[in-house]
């Protein structure tokens, strides 16, 4: 196993809407074809996988039907879309990549990107 | 995945044994090869990149088995030389096809059996 | 290269019983795991992928379950077409590796 840089942006707000988006970028050594990335969250001192794809350069990443996760490939950059995001989800979302083909098999965690999610007021009722 | 049909080789011969692609674009999915000998399992062989065409194999049959693949007919090639009578298996090309985190092989050929026998 | 072990080697069941068919890897390879079913002169046709999630066009009669270095898959009630061979496959690390398979025939 080789280690690989991954860097990801420090602070991220979710939407009104409960969606946080940011860019996982890894530096590949070589010329790796297919790709796997995991998000995983960190909250109090616990981890938790929250999507992971395997895809092949070029292709669409595609997460399991029931992910809270999408995504879209570019070069050696990642842009993931978490949705149905609320308070309580606000944590340390890490990215993991790891360059499964051709060999060697390299693996890169990245320092983690601070979620905040803050829950919409609810409306007041009208008067009107 | 329409496989080429059934071959007798004698030992010392060699077998090459196409793989035709349809109904996908050919350039987005790995293949691989797989054989199976006579009440066996399934062994790995290898893999080839139908973009580039970048291969690799199995350690077991390095320097005798040779992939290839031909993008104007969409068509894949496993190649193995050297034959001798512990070869004698079905040969499968297979997709491979990822969902979520987890890869799998989806759709296969019929399979190519191939008898080493003098 | 990950060995895959999968017991038993052969079983004998009856249509209706309920079947219980083992994997396990020699590290653990998460939930990265596939199932297959062969039936005599045919391609292996998949069943189950990433240790649970059920391929498309199979009966639900089929599940999974596991991750780490046990899975299992069973069958709640048997059918006649069930009678095959069935084998395990990781797909955590290069290269894929299968078990060496379980029969499943009538008792």
């Known amino acids: 196993c080789k280690a690989m840089h991954v860097a990801q942006p420090a602070v991220v707000l979710a939407s009104s809407r409960g969606i946080a988006s940011f860019v996982c970028e890894y530096a590949s050594p070589g010329k790796a074809t297919e790709v796997r990335v995991t998000v995983l969250r960190q909250a109090d001192s616990q981890v938790t996988e929250v999507c992971a794809a395997t895809y092949m350069m070029g292709n669409e990443l595609t997460f399991l039907d029931d992910s809270i996760c999408t995504g879209t490939s570019s070069g050696n950059q990642v842009n993931l879309t978490i949705q149905g995001l609320r308070a309580m989800d606000t944590g340390l979302y890490i990215c993991k990549v790891e360059l499964m083909y051709p060999p060697p098999y390299y693996l890169g965690i990245g320092n983690g990107t601070q979620i905040y999610v803050i829950d919409p007021e609810p409306c007041p009722d009208s008067d009107f | 995945l329409v496989q080429s049909g059934a071959e007798v080789k004698k030992p010392g011969a060699s077998v090459k044994v196409s793989c035709e692609a349809s109904g996908y674009t050919f350039t987005n999915y790995y293949i691989h090869w797989l054989r199976q000998a006579p009440g066996q399992g399934l062994e790995w062989m290898g893999i080839i990149n139908p973009s580039g065409g970048s291969t690799t194999y199995a350690q077991k049959f390095q320097g005798r088995i040779t992939m290839t693949r031909d993008t104007s007919t969409n068509t894949l090639y496993m190649e193995l030389s050297s034959l001798r009578s512990e070869d004698t298996a079905i040969y499968y090309c297979?997709?491979?096809?990822?969902?979520?985190?987890?890869?799998?092989?989806?759709?296969w050929g019929q399979g190519t059996t191939v008898t080493v026998s003098s | 290269s990950i060995v895959m072990t999968q017991s038993p080697s052969s079983l004998s069941a009856s249509v209706g019983d309920r079947v219980t068919i083992t994997c396990r890897a020699s590290q653990s390879i998460s939930s990265y795991l596939n199932w297959y079913q062969q039936k005599p002169g045919k391609a292996p046709k998949l069943l189950i992928y990433a240790a649970s999630s059920l391929q498309s066009g199979v009966p639900p009669r089929f599940s999974g379950s596991g991750s780490g270095t046990e899975f299992t898959l069973t069958i709640s009630s048997l059918q006649p077409e069930d009678f095959a061979t069935y084998y395990c496959q990781q797909a955590n690390s290069f290269p894929p590796t299968f078990g060496q398979g379980t029969k499943v025939d009538i008792k």
């Open positions: 297979a997709r491979r096809d990822c969902r979520g985190p987890s890869c799998y092989f989806a759709y």
